[in-house]
């Protein structure tokens, strides 16, 4: 399987709501042995690999927002701590997987990360991540609503959570 | 506070039986996968078993498959290992830790430490 | 099964030196390694995860590096609490292994 991110770059005025997405797409076993899970983290663009680093969004880690299922099975995080933070992360029974992050500000300006590991019995794991820059404007230069950029280059795209 | 307590541990003869328990606090211990992992006196770490958040799927080292079963209680937040037909190979101090797919051992208890010796 | 071999098995320094682990695996593990400290008594510590990242709170002056099968963990200046022992650790394939171990001891 792969993970595909629509939109590379979500521009965004403060104060606004966005979702983030990626789209889990290719042969996905639904079997009994098989399971997903999903999650976001922030990161950096290293040298080496991108999404390497795995940085907390708003203080909760990876750990906190992820979510486990089966197959293409739809799921949220029902995390009290994850919504006091404006945070939610879902998956729906297309493949697509989000972080819905409410309220923006500066701070949340930066490059974001979904990973999917597929856990097969008794074989290794397969990690796929994707990357998206988030960048947080203000002022009088900030678009009115989220503008997003997909992933091949082509037109901008506004956007509501 | 974020912490694993083991406990059960102590003396067994050969052929006995033991059953250790990891007590989980100050996290969501049904999102988390659990492993045990031991450590023989002076020696390095060894990978024991591995349970899933739901219980399924388990996994246990060739060197206690049929002997040692893995089993947890989200309910109770705890985690056990039931140790049966021990042998003076399997003394070794026993550590819970904390798991999760595509990560690794974040978190680790104290240790209860485990002596088979007749 | 994956074996991890570390060298050296015992590393004689003195404080403000610098440290150099190296972890070794009998096939690849891709870049799915870590580092893990343990001092007497105590409960392993994770300070290097996904064979070139830190574990948070750890500091700067330890470093990893390292994909496939040969892996290092640096210390770049030794404090007084980094003697120790030091464990690699891979999760590419079942069953999770751990290397041997290096221990880092004061000269």
């Known amino acids: 399987f792969k993970v595909a991110t629509l939109y590379s770059l979500y521009v965004c005025p403060e104060g606004q709501n966005v979702t983030l997405t990626c789209r889990v797409f290719g042969p996905v076993d639904k079997g009994h042995d098989v399971t997903f899970y999903k999650t976001w983290y922030r990161s950096s663009r290293g040298e080496v690999q991108t999404c390497s680093e795995r940085r907390p969004i708003r203080n909760l880690t990876f750990q906190d927002l992820h979510l486990h299922h089966g197959g293409h099975q739809a799921a949220n995080t029902s995390h009290d701590l994850a919504q006091r933070h404006g945070l939610e992360s879902a998956s729906d029974h297309h493949g697509n997987f989000s972080i819905t992050m409410r309220n923006l500000t500066l701070l949340d300006s930066g490059l974001y990360c979904c990973l999917v590991v597929e856990i097969r019995h008794h074989h290794s794991e397969h990690r796929v991540h994707g990357a998206m820059e988030l960048q947080v404007q203000t002022g009088k230069d900030a678009p009115s609503s989220c503008v997003a950029y997909p992933s091949s280059s082509q037109e901008s795209e506004n956007i509501t959570a | 506070q974020v912490q694993l307590v083991e406990s059960g541990g102590g003396l067994v003869k050969p052929g006995g039986s033991l059953r250790l328990s990891c007590a989980a606090s100050?996290?969501?211990?049904?999102?988390?996968?659990m492993s045990w992992i031991r450590q023989a006196p002076g020696k390095g770490l060894e990978w024991v078993s591995y349970?899933?958040?739901?219980?399924?799927?388990?996994y246990y080292a060739d060197s206690v498959k049929g002997r040692f079963t893995i089993s947890r209680d989200n309910a109770k937040n705890s985690l056990y290992l039931q140790m049966n037909s021990l042998r003076a190979e399997d003394t070794a101090v026993y550590y819970c830790?904390?798991?999760?797919?595509?990560?690794?051992?974040?978190?680790w208890g104290r240790g209860t430490l485990v002596t088979v010796s007749s | 099964e994956i074996v991890l071999t570390q060298s050296p098995a015992t590393l004689s320094l003195s404080p403000g030196e610098r440290a150099t682990l190296s972890c070794r695996a009998s096939?690849?593990?891709?870049?799915?390694l870590a580092w893990y400290q343990q001092k007497p008594g105590q409960a392993p510590r994770l300070l290097i995860y996904d064979a070139s990242n830190r574990a948070t709170g750890i500091p700067a002056r330890f470093s990893a590096s390292g994909s496939g099968t040969d892996f290092t963990l640096t210390i770049s200046s030794l404090e007084p609490e980094d003697f120790a022992v030091y464990y690699c650790?891979?999760?590419?394939?079942?069953?999770?292994?751990f290397g041997q171990g290096t221990k880092v001891e004061i000269k």
């Open positions: 830790a904390r798991d999760l797919p595509g990560w690794y051992f974040d978190l």
């Open positions: 349970i899933s958040n739901s219980g399924s799927p388990i």
């Open positions: 096939q690849s593990v891709s870049s799915y």
């Open positions: 650790q891979q999760r590419n394939n079942w069953p999770r292994t």
């Open positions: 100050g996290f969501t211990f049904s999102d988390y996968y």
